[in-house]
Interface confidence: medium
């Protein structure tokens, strides 16, 4: 069967969300990840989308991920505008309304969003084959 | 063709206000957030303030929260940049910024030093 578009979508989101770093993906969020085993794909989802939601909800006028400069600034801004497009596509690749996140393990989300891209072309490729 | 023009920079007293603009022109003002950003002597750019393109969402650094207020009015083209409490730490040249994905066109700057 054909992969979904919001599927290529993602993993261009994630590739280009992983190739710089900012001033905050050193931050840690909620590791859904370490204890995955029981969970659904569509679980998966919807959670790793409301872990995102809870960063840039947190941290979308941080001054200290803002940083001092105008590239940081606008790094930062990129960031979440990339983010909120991630958590959008998730969300439509869920297709739950909602999902608990309760783990108490923390990644950094550079972490996070690599373990997230490996989770997505793992997917693209046995639905691409 | 580009442009910006800054004016209302001086000299002031510590504790003092001023109100700089920025008149823009050869860009669909209305379309693009705007920011102000400033050099102090010797010093490296540093953002100041950011505002989006309908002037409903606002950013401030944290040296500035609190004593400056961005605004816009797009219906003039301009974007204000009202700052009280000076410090003598807010010298500098004060630079307004066209924002799209980056900083991508500047005005010439107006000076603003605060001493007594």
């Known amino acids: 069967h054909k992969c979904d578009i919001t599927l290529q979508e993602i993993i261009k989101t994630l590739n280009s969300l992983t190739e710089q770093k900012t001033l905050c993906t050193e931050l840690t969020v909620t590791d859904i990840f370490a204890a995955s085993k029981n969970t659904t794909e569509k679980e998966t989802f919807c959670r790793a989308a409301t872990v995102l939601r809870q960063f840039y909800s947190h941290h979308e006028k941080d001054t200290r991920c803002l940083g001092a400069t105008a590239q940081q600034f606008h790094r930062h801004k990129q960031l979440i505008r990339f983010l909120k497009r991630l958590d959008r596509n998730l969300w439509g690749l869920a297709g739950l309304n909602s999902c608990p996140v309760k783990e108490a393990n923390q990644s950094t989300l550079e972490n996070f969003l690599e373990r997230l891209k490996t989770i997505m072309r793992e997917k693209y490729s046995k639905c691409s084959s | 063709e580009v442009q910006l023009l800054e004016s209302g920079g001086g000299l002031v007293q510590p504790g003092g206000s001023l109100r700089l603009s920025c008149a823009a022109s050869?860009?669909?003002?209305?379309?693009?957030?705007m920011a102000w950003v400033r050099q102090a002597p010797g010093k490296g750019l540093e953002w100041v303030s950011w505002?989006?393109?309908?002037?409903?969402?606002?950013y401030y650094a944290d040296s500035v929260k609190g004593r400056f207020t961005i605004s816009r009015d797009n219906s003039k083209n301009t974007l204000y940049l009202q700052m009280n409490s000076l410090r003598a730490e807010d010298t500098a040249v004060y630079y307004c910024?066209?924002?799209?994905?980056?900083?991508?066109?500047w005005g010439q700057g107006t000076l603003v030093t605060v001493s007594s």
């Open positions: 505002i989006d393109a309908s002037g409903t969402e606002t």
């Open positions: 910024a066209k924002s799209a994905g980056r900083f991508d066109y």
């Open positions: 050869g860009f669909t003002f209305r379309n693009y957030g």
